[in-house]
């Protein structure tokens, strides 16, 4: 048993059939002696009497608020909240494994830029009775400073007849240089509590290796005279890291139909213009990726062709 | 000040040119060693991340743009040693900045050279006949040293009597590629940088 | 699956007109870009341009323009190229290559032999 | 126009052997570059694109790399039927253009 936060403690249970639980005596938090007696969340039954109670805790049933009062008086109380163990592995029940960019991904992050902030979201079909708390640092053995705000619900979403909620957190780290080559991960924990259910997830990443800088912005068309060819210019998007001229970027300029399956012209560079070949009922999108360092490309910023 | 987004022609800078060779080079052999060494553990993930260079050079810092000299984080371990004439330095009016950012370069390069050449010494006694450094990495940063032309001691190359534990020389050649390839980035975004001043 | 199917060889005069045709199967002529691509005997590869079937859109190399006609006909999924004006060293294997890539050459058809001689 | 000059002309490799081609642009094309193995008597066939995008069905030893002027393809160990020409082609801008080719041929 561990002390969560003030008056919450975590028990952890290896969960397998007529399993013994463990034993917990918890102790209420009075000066007095005498004529206290406990009871489990709503209930009025007395549990037991005395300054500590024992108890095994077995299953949820064990699990909740214990109380302890003295003549019809609340003196202290202690949630008691189960996290489950099977088979060797702590249960992954409230999240909602994401598969990307691999199985067991439960917190997937980005950021915008080298800045030193970053955000991550989860997912889950739970709607209710459901808190997050999270903490992040660089490195874990001698922890330097990130500091996360709360986690909040940032979309929900109908997945055939379940509905999914996504929860998103930001978080800064304190002393940030965006040149830095960083050789100590980010190390971000989350704890999540359904009910009297408690579980906790993890993610460890570099910066650079989560780098998803926003669509370029200001995108413009130029036709060329006596030619099919069009030229299309953008800016590098206001998010990005400066100066450009060391944060470079490059981009992917493409011009496509509605369909996926459609044919395409496309082009990769540097610069921000390029000239492609504007169809009829096509769109001209452009995209861009840190051009030193290959993490993820950015949304498409489209412009239609006519 | 608003410094160009294109990337003028590398002629204009003959260390930029060399620079986007070396991180090609090193991303190619890094990514060889992944798949080559596959049972090993060879991905970010799984490696410890050193850099054979901490404090003997100084890259990130005496590299700063001039942007980042502002952010506090940025200048914790700032090093003030003069060093003089590169090749790379376009004009007498170079900064003596400039000149203490592309020594720490070059002997950065250098260090990783004297470790790479050790390394494919003790490779090349492997029996498996595993995995071999790249001879276009050695070339390349040879050809980024002879670039940049500064005048430094001669770092003798490391030779061990010990029987080689080829086990352990693979994981550190995973490591040195890791980190090799980190500051690679770091020397094109410089080279970037300055061919853009 | 996809293919190009090119028409047989031609020899040709000086001063004349050669008209390729290249057949398409295995796929609808309009879902994918067609070009033109010529090898001279024992050289290499040269682009002379591009048709978009849809639409009837074409561009030519600098080298070609005005001598050459690309079209299509999708009603029996075939692309022609004309070339006029013949001379010598047009003597070359002509292919027809197709891509839903605009600027690369995925599908190629088994090249057309046209000589050109006095 | 982009003129792009591969080499060597002709690479004589044993096989079994590791066999590099050269290719390089007249101006940087960033990775738009696509690699093409032709037989005696046959068409072009597409190998890798975009510089070092691999195609279903191309044995993977073939690989490439490079970016702005210089691109490398690599065979990493030479089967028989792999002797051929291979040619690079740029799609930076128009017109395209075609390397003139490495001839890999038996040792």
């Known amino acids: 048993i561990w002390e969560l936060k003030k008056d919450v403690y975590v028990v952890e249970l290896d969960w397998y059939p007529d399993a013994p639980g463990e034993m917990v005596v918890l102790t209420c938090d009075t000066p007095e002696e005498d004529g206290i007696t406990w009871t489990l969340d709503q209930s009025s039954e007395v549990l037991g009497s005395g300054k500590t109670l024992t108890i095994q805790v077995k299953e949820f049933g064990d699990a909740g608020q214990y109380t302890c009062h003295k003549g019809g008086e609340v003196l202290s109380h202690s949630l008691l909240l189960l996290h489950k163990k099977e088979d060797g592995i702590w249960s992954t029940d409230i999240l909602k494994d994401q598969k990307e960019p691999k199985n067991k991904t439960f917190l997937r992050c980005e950021a915008k830029n080298y800045s030193g902030r970053f955000t991550c979201w989860w997912l889950t079909t739970i709607s209710t009775d459901l808190t997050f708390s999270v903490k992040s640092s660089r490195g874990s053995s001698d922890p330097q400073g990130v500091t996360c705000g709360a986690a909040t619900l940032s979309a929900e979403r109908v997945r055939g007849d379940n509905k999914e909620y996504e929860y998103s957190v930001e978080c800064q780290e304190d002393s940030a240089c965006p040149a830095a080559e960083e050789s100590l991960p980010i190390e971000v924990m989350v704890d999540a509590v359904h009910k009297l259910k408690y579980e906790n997830y993890t993610s460890s990443f570099f910066i650079r290796d989560i780098i998803k800088p926003d669509p370029p912005k200001n995108l413009q068309l130029k036709p060329l005279k006596n030619s099919r060819q069009v030229e299309v210019s953008w800016e590098y998007p206001d998010t990005w890291s400066t100066p450009h001229s060391y944060f470079s970027l490059t981009f992917c300029v493409q011009v496509q139909g509605k369909s996926k399956r459609e044919k395409k012209d496309r082009v990769f560079t540097d610069k921000t213009s390029a000239t492609v070949i504007c169809r009829k009922n096509a769109s001209i999108s452009v995209r861009a990726q840190d051009r030193y360092y290959s993490s993820s490309w950015s949304e498409w910023a489209s412009v239609p062709c006519s | 000040r608003n410094l160009p987004v294109a990337t003028p022609d590398p002629g204009m800078f003959p260390c930029l040119h060399h620079s986007q060779n070396l991180l090609r080079a090193v991303s190619n052999m890094l990514q060889k060693a992944r798949q080559t060494l596959e049972f090993y553990p060879c991905t970010s993930e799984e490696i410890d991340h050193e850099d054979i260079t901490k404090d003997k050079t100084s890259t990130v810092e005496a590299c700063l743009p001039l942007e980042l000299t502002k952010n506090e984080s940025c200048l914790n371990s700032r090093e003030t040693s003069f060093i003089t004439n590169g090749s790379c330095l376009a004009s007498r009016k170079t900064s003596f900045m400039m000149a203490l950012c592309l020594s720490s370069i070059y002997e950065d390069l250098k260090m990783y050279q004297v470790e790479f050449k050790t390394m494919n010494a003790k490779l090349l006694m492997d029996p498996k006949r595993q995995i071999f450094l790249d001879q276009n990495m050695l070339a390349v940063i040879d050809e980024l040293m002879q670039a940049l032309n500064f005048n430094s001691e001669t770092v003798p190359q490391k030779s061990s009597l010990e029987e080689p534990d080829f086990y352990k020389t693979k994981i550190k050649l995973c490591i040195l590629l890791h980190a090799f390839r980190i500051r690679a980035v770091t020397i094109d975004r410089v080279m970037s940088y300055l061919n853009a001043s | 699956q996809v293919q190009l199917v090119q028409s047989g060889a031609e020899v040709k005069k000086p001063g004349a007109s050669v008209k390729v045709s290249c057949k398409a199967s295995?796929?609808?002529?309009?879902?994918?870009?067609l070009h033109w691509v010529r090898q001279a005997p024992g050289q290499g590869l040269e682009w002379m341009g591009w048709i978009d079937p849809e639409n009837g859109d074409t561009e030519s190399a600098p080298k070609f323009q005005g001598r050459v006609t690309m079209t299509t006909d999708t009603s029996t999924s075939t692309a022609y190229m004309e070339l006029r004006s013949l001379r010598s060293d047009d003597t070359a294997v002509y292919y027809c290559?197709?891509?839903?890539?605009?600027?690369?050459?995925?599908?190629w058809g088994q090249g057309t032999m046209v000589t050109v001689s006095s | 126009e982009i003129v792009m000059t591969q080499s060597p002309a002709t690479l004589s490799v044993s096989p079994g052997e590791r066999a590099t081609l050269s290719c390089r642009a007249s101006q940087s094309i960033s990775i738009n570059l696509h690699w093409y193995q032709q037989k005696p008597g046959q068409a072009p066939r597409l190998l890798i694109y975009f510089a070092s995008q691999s195609i279903s069905g191309i044995p993977a030893r073939f690989s490439g790399s490079g970016s702005g002027t210089e691109f490398t393809l690599t065979i990493s160990s030479l089967q028989s039927e792999d002797f051929a020409v291979y040619y690079c082609q740029q799609s930076n801008s128009f017109p395209l253009t075609f390397g003139g080719g490495t001839k890999v041929e038996i040792k």
């Open positions: 290559a197709a891509n839903k890539e605009l600027r690369y050459f995925d599908v």
């Open positions: 295995g796929y609808t002529l309009t879902d994918y870009y």
